[in-house]
Interface confidence: low
């Protein structure tokens, strides 16, 4: 196979957040992030190769304690395909409850043209620290 | 490609811990752990092949309940490059808050000679159960 | 190498659960789940190729809040080899404490014929939402 398509993204939001959608970025200005195959469009990741992908994400809430997290509950993170509309689906969802970090991963088939969106519902802001909040994909097989 | 460099490590510290650095081990005496490419030096993992790696870690606190975890807060785990000093950086960081286990993963470029260190700050001890605490890397592409 | 053996499974239990063992399923009727190499036998995953595998799992408790989770503590998830009996071992274990989701992953050697079981101890039920509860494996190398 050619080198597998991969991406590791850092948060690139401007605050205060006007909508629940997290915007991602990559490149030297954003730590050790990169895109190698997939592309960023307005802060969302667009897939350029069909196949099975491993998605992973970690999001840490800024200025957060167990008390903050539970008081602002429910704070939920969801990763899904947001376009094309015909393929719209939630792929991964986690709530923070009394914690300030969620992290997970999964294998899922994605198609060329799928755009991935990550939504953080609730009033808390995500941390932009490069070791606390990140989102990545890795092509695994056709 | 040749077989990808991989490692899955188990905790190998002696306690009480004098410093926050966790020491890892591998081999038949430590469950199903191994190093295949990277090497252990004084309990830290040294990379022997440039490339993009998937890091993953799970750490469970010993003798821990939600109450213990919150009373000993902040207990934080950080994984980073600790040498060479010129490349020192935190790659992955999580706090326990009211939980007793953290688990995460990420993609990050590493270079031959990079040594990875894992620091657990706080007074709680990590569990050395082989199914509760482990740290691993997998080479993904150049 | 040929395409790596992979599987991504969804929960296929019928409730109320009579025993702590979670039963998994795959295929079009269960979201974006599939088996590609390994096979399902009575809801458990059977490995058909020796090698190093990456296991990952996320389990979310249904009708759960921090209060529920702590009141029903301990709720624990364990993933292990349950047959053949001679290779029986716990590979991955997490407790929920005051959270309602656990997620983790690890690298572990598996052999052809190993059957993986996932046990959820406690009285709470897992969510069957396809973006909240899933279990997968990916062959990494021989």
């Amino acid at each position: 196979h050619p080198e597998p398509h991969t991406a590791e993204l850092q948060l690139n939001l401007t605050v205060p957040r006007k909508d629940p959608t997290l915007r991602w970025g990559a490149g030297p200005a954003l730590g050790r992030s990169f895109t190698h195959g997939p592309e960023l469009e307005e802060g969302h990741l667009r897939i350029h190769q069909d196949g099975l992908y491993r998605l992973h994400i970690q999001v840490t809430l800024a200025i957060c304690s167990s008390t903050t997290a539970s008081r602002h509950h429910p704070t939920t993170l969801a990763v899904g395909i947001c376009s094309p509309a015909s393929r719209s689906i939630s792929l991964l969802r986690l709530s923070f409850h009394q914690g300030c970090t969620i992290a997970s991963q999964r294998l899922t088939p994605l198609a060329r043209g799928d755009t991935l969106c990550t939504n953080l519902t609730g009033t808390l802001l995500p941390s932009r620290n490069t070791d606390e909040t990140f989102f990545g994909v890795q092509w695994v097989r056709p | 490609h040749p077989e990808p460099h991989t490692a899955e490590l188990q905790l190998n510290l002696t306690v009480p811990r004098k410093d926050p650095t966790l020491r890892w081990g591998a081999g038949p005496a430590l469950g199903r752990s191994f190093t295949h490419g990277p090497e252990l030096e004084e309990g830290h993992l040294r990379i022997h092949q440039d490339g993009l790696y998937r890091l993953h870690i799970q750490v469970t606190l010993a003798i821990c309940s939600s109450t213990t975890a919150s009373r000993h807060h902040p207990t934080t785990l950080a994984v980073g490059i600790c040498s060479p000093a010129s490349r020192s950086i935190s790659l992955l960081r999580l706090s326990f808050h009211q939980g007793c286990t953290i688990a995460s993963q990420r993609l990050t470029p590493l270079a031959r000679g990079d040594t990875l260190c894992t620091n657990l700050t706080g007074t709680l001890l990590p569990s050395r159960n082989t199914d509760e605490t482990f740290f691993g890397v997998q080479w993904v592409r150049p | 190498h040929p395409e790596p053996h992979t599987a991504e499974l969804q929960l296929n239990l019928t409730v109320p659960r009579k025993d702590p063992t979670l039963r998994w399923g795959a295929g079009p009727a269960l979201g974006r789940s599939f088996t590609h190499g390994p096979e399902l036998e009575e809801g458990h995953l059977r490995i058909h190729q020796d090698g190093l595998y990456r296991l990952h799992i996320q389990v979310t408790l249904a009708i759960c809040s921090s209060t529920t989770a702590s009141r029903h503590h301990p709720t624990t998830l364990a993933v292990g080899i349950c047959s053949p009996a001679s290779r029986s071992i716990s590979l991955l274990r997490l407790s929920f404490h005051q959270g309602c989701t656990i997620a983790s992953q690890r690298l572990t050697p598996l052999a052809r014929g190993d059957t993986l079981c996932t046990n959820l101890t406690g009285t709470l039920l897992p969510s069957r939402n396809t973006d909240e509860t899933f279990f997968g494996v990916q062959w990494v190398r021989p």
Partner: antibody, heavy 122, light 111 residues
Framework: EVQLVESGGGLVQPGGSLRLSCAAS????????MNWVRQAPGKGLEWVSD????????YYADSVKGRFTISRDNSKNSLYLQMNSLRAEDTAVYYC???????????????WGQGTLVTVSS | QAVVTQEPSLTVSPGGTVTLTCGLK?????????PTWYQQTPGQAPRLLIY???TRHSGVPDRFSGSILGNKAALTITGAQADDEAEYFC??????????FGGGTQLTVLG
């Protein structure tokens, strides 16, 4: 219900050997660290040895190091203690004890067998 | 010579309160020693009562409580009952991987 049943004790001469067994039931044996703890007649408790859940890591009290070997067979839900070069001071009731798994840096014994008596005497 | 020290014997009246202590021959006991308490009645195996200084094991009545008192770990029994008559052992975590047990305290419930 957790049950631990020891066997294999008895009278042995100094320098002799004995193998103790512990049959476990009522819990997932392969998840737990297991221990041997002994109690000399009319005395206190002494931790002897532990073995991790997979059987790959073992620790021993200094008093038995090099003479005793702990092992387990997860497929048989069994724990063993091979005792060689026995001395009079090894005379004790030997208990098989499960580590509570809270977790296992600090041995906390939440389930015990009834013990088996080992007498070392000429 | 025992590293972990306990009173050899104590007496309490039914319904009374008694505190057993567990010290180190040299140094203070702290929560980092993870004090653990076991109860043993004649001819029986020990039973776990308290771990991690003050956490009651499941099924242990709430008249048993653990704490650090000064430089020692303590087990307090309030409202003592006849079946609390037993030997009590404390265990301290001193160095990996072992625990050191105290010599035990024989508790007598008078009456």
């Amino acid at each position: 219900e957790v049950q631990l049943v020891e066997s294999g004790g008895g009278l042995v001469q100094p320098g002799g050997s004995l193998r103790l067994s512990c049959a476990a039931s009522g819990f997932t044996f392969s998840v737990y660290y297991m221990n041997w703890v002994r109690q000399a007649p009319g005395k206190g408790l002494e931790w002897v040895s532990d073995i991790n859940n997979e059987g790959g890591t073992t620790y021993y009290a200094d008093s038995v190091k090099g003479r005793f070997t702990i092992s387990r067979d997860n497929s048989k839900n069994s724990l063993y203690l091979q005792m060689n070069s026995l001395r009079a001071e090894d005379t004790a009731v030997y208990y098989c004890a499960r580590d509570a798994g809270y977790s296992n840096h600090v041995p906390i014994f939440d389930s015990w067998g009834q013990g088996t008596l080992v007498t070392v005497s000429s | 010579q025992a590293v972990v020290t306990q009173e050899p014997s104590l007496t309490v009246s039914p319904g009374g309160t008694v505190t057993l202590t567990c010290g180190l021959k040299s140094g203070s006991v702290t929560s980092d020693n993870f004090p653990t308490w076991y109860q043993q009645t004649p001819g029986q195996a020990p039973r776990l009562l308290i771990y991690n200084t003050n956490t009651r094991h499941s099924g242990v009545p709430d008249r048993f409580s653990g704490s650090i008192l000064g430089n020692k770990a303590a087990l307090t029994i309030t409202g003592a009952q006849a079946d609390d008559e037993a030997e009590y052992f404390c265990a301290l975590f001193i160095s990996n991987p072992s625990v050191e047990f105290g010599g035990g305290t024989q508790l007598t419930v008078l009456g």
